[in-house]
Interface confidence: low
């Protein structure tokens, strides 16, 4: 009865040419031990002959040989409960099915397993959380769906070019569930990190660039200001004029209100980006910002301490 | 350290009834096949039987068959040799031993041995 | 079941002699997966066998080399090169290929 066979396994493996692929797989038979087991690539099942066809890869025979191939692929089991698979080196025309075929005393099963192996390294992934703001710490991570025991690889981050200096955690999985080297780098961001490319690069052992993959930050921020004042030491007499500007340098999202602050009070109908003060008078004196919002929330530029002497 | 340690051993009369424990530590208890063996007094090793923790698979020698039964709880670590109808023959040291490897299948950890007398 | 039979059942030998037992299986126990389930185990008076050899020819970690193993098909041997004294015990062969898994019946190394 082939329904006592319950295999688990990664349903698809990715490496690429010269890598290696490592197949974590366990499985069940009710009545007994394994006797015998072939590793086929692509099988086909021939009606005629009531058999499979197709390249062997591996072999388990009475007298213990295998074929040349069994150097490159590597039965990693057992008689009854693990299937584990080692191919290395692997090689571009390695992709397809791999048919583990099973045989018991009164059972027969073909397990198949995807392979997909590619001809260059193929990229990492990076995930970033769906928002990210100015100085709070977020994780990236850096995903790539391939890790074997004999093909060490590492992760790096850069920012614009230039390795970060967190100190990233790497965790691969090699289980029946899943097959992945991850790396995950803790990082509080500031507003001047907005814009800036961030890459996670594939090196092997040696630190030898294999693949990469990037991504541009867009951290939420709120509006970044620079107030200037004509005269530019902010000292006055009664009666004088008095310009303030208010500059955006930076803001994300875009900005929706302007507004004018004394001694941290608002100033009423002052909701643009210049403030004229005309003929001041002495009760002007004091300390004036401007403050723009967002979504994020306000941004204040640094204070301005005007002085109004007497004529 | 991996270790096993057996318990529950003692005298029991012909037709009684006796649970062995086999406590693991240091390993990974559900992955890996726990076997039991006895040794009658001045006699040779005998393979009684295994259990996969794992999931409860079991095998035994046939003659072992009905009488003993092999069981194990991962929460607690330890297997169990349970023996009914015991026999004067039944009297042996019983050891517990791993199977240490998951393709070589060796015995590469044993226990101390506990001792069952079958006698009236 | 598959017999192992191990010759002698007990022999007498100095420090520094070469020994060497025999096991031999009343059948193949060549699994059919490739690999050939033969150990064998050293017993001491009073406590838990040990293993020296698996796979007929693999020594244990922690083995001396001076304990090796060969043999195929039904015939296997285990060497001791040079008898020390810690070496004076029991030997038992164990086939785990074939349901039920057997053990030979002993090989006592005694001090001559």
């Known amino acids: 009865d082939s329904s006592k066979w319950v295999f688990e396994h990664p349903e698809t493996l990715y490496a690429w040419e010269g890598a290696c692929v490592w197949i974590p797989c366990t499985y069940r038979a009710l009545d007994g031990d394994l006797e015998s087991f072939i590793l086929f690539h692509n099988p086909e099942y021939n009606k005629n002959t009531s058999k499979f066809d197709g390249t062997r890869l591996y072999e388990s025979t009475k007298d213990g040989k295998v074929p040349s191939e069994q150097k490159r692929v590597q039965f990693l089991g057992d008689k009854n409960k693990n299937c584990t698979l080692s191919i290395h080196p692997v090689h571009l025309n390695d992709s397809g099915q791999l048919g583990l075929r099973m045989e018991s005393k009164t059972e027969k099963w073909m397990e198949r397993i995807h392979l997909n192996v590619s001809e260059r390294p193929f990229p990492p992934h990076i995930q970033l959380p769906p928002e990210i703001q100015e100085s709070q710490e977020v994780t990236l991570t850096c995903l790539l769906n391939f890790s074997c025991y004999g093909y060490p690889i590492q992760l790096q981050w850069l920012l614009e070019g230039v390795p970060m200096r967190q100190a990233a955690v790497t965790s691969t999985s090699l289980t029946i569930k899943s097959v992945f080297t991850r790396s995950e780098l803790k990082f509080s961001p500031q507003w001047s990190h907005h814009g800036k490319i961030v890459t996670c690069q594939l090196q092997d052992a040696d630190g030898k660039f294999l693949s990469n993959d990037t991504v541009q930050l867009n951290v939420k921020h709120t509006p970044k200001l620079e107030i200037k004042v004509t005269p530019s030491d902010a000292i006055v007499r009664e009666g004088d004029s008095v310009t303030m500007t208010c500059e955006v340098s930076s803001s994300n999202p875009e900005y929706t209100t302007v507004s004018w602050l004394k001694d941290g009070t608002s100033l009423k109908k002052q909701n643009t980006f210049t403030l004229n003060l005309r003929e001041v008078t002495k009760d002007q004196s004091g300390k004036y910002c401007c403050q723009v919002s967002n979504d994020v929330g306000p941004g204040r530029s640094e204070e301005v301490f005007l002085q109004v002497q007497y004529a | 350290e991996v270790q096993l340690v057996e318990s529950g051993g003692g005298l029991v009369q012909p037709g009684g009834s006796l649970r062995l424990s086999c406590a693991a530590s240091?390993?990974?208890?559900?992955?890996?096949?726990m076997n039991w063996v006895r040794q009658a007094p001045g006699k040779g090793l005998e393979w009684v039987g295994r259990i996969y923790p794992g999931d409860g698979d079991t095998n035994y020698s046939g003659k072992f068959k009905g009488r003993f039964t092999i069981s194990a709880d991962t929460s607690k670590n330890t297997a169990y040799l349970q023996m009914n109808s015991l026999r004067a023959e039944d009297t042996a040291v019983y050891y517990c031993?791993?199977?240490?490897?998951?393709?070589?299948?060796?015995?590469?950890?044993w226990g101390q041995g506990t001792l069952v007398t079958v006698s009236s | 079941d598959i017999q192992m039979t191990q010759s002698p059942s007990s022999l007498s030998a100095s420090v520094g002699d070469r020994v060497t037992i025999t096991c031999r299986s009343s059948?193949?126990?060549?699994?059919?997966?490739?690999?050939?389930?033969l150990e064998w185990y050293q017993q001491k008076p009073g406590k838990a066998p040990k293993l020296l050899i698996y796979k007929v020819s693999n020594r244990f970690s922690g083995v001396p080399s001076r304990f090796s193993g060969s043999g195929s098909g039904t015939d296997f041997t285990l060497t001791i090169s040079s008898l020390q004294p810690e070496d004076f015990a029991t030997y038992y062969c164990f086939q785990g290929s074939q349901f039920p898994y057997t053990f030979g019946q002993g090989t006592k190394v005694e001090i001559k």
């Open positions: 059948q193949s126990i060549v699994h059919s997966v490739g690999n050939t389930f």
């Open positions: 031993a791993r199977d240490g490897s998951s393709w070589d299948w060796y015995f590469d950890v």
């Open positions: 240091g390993y990974e208890f559900s992955r890996s096949w």
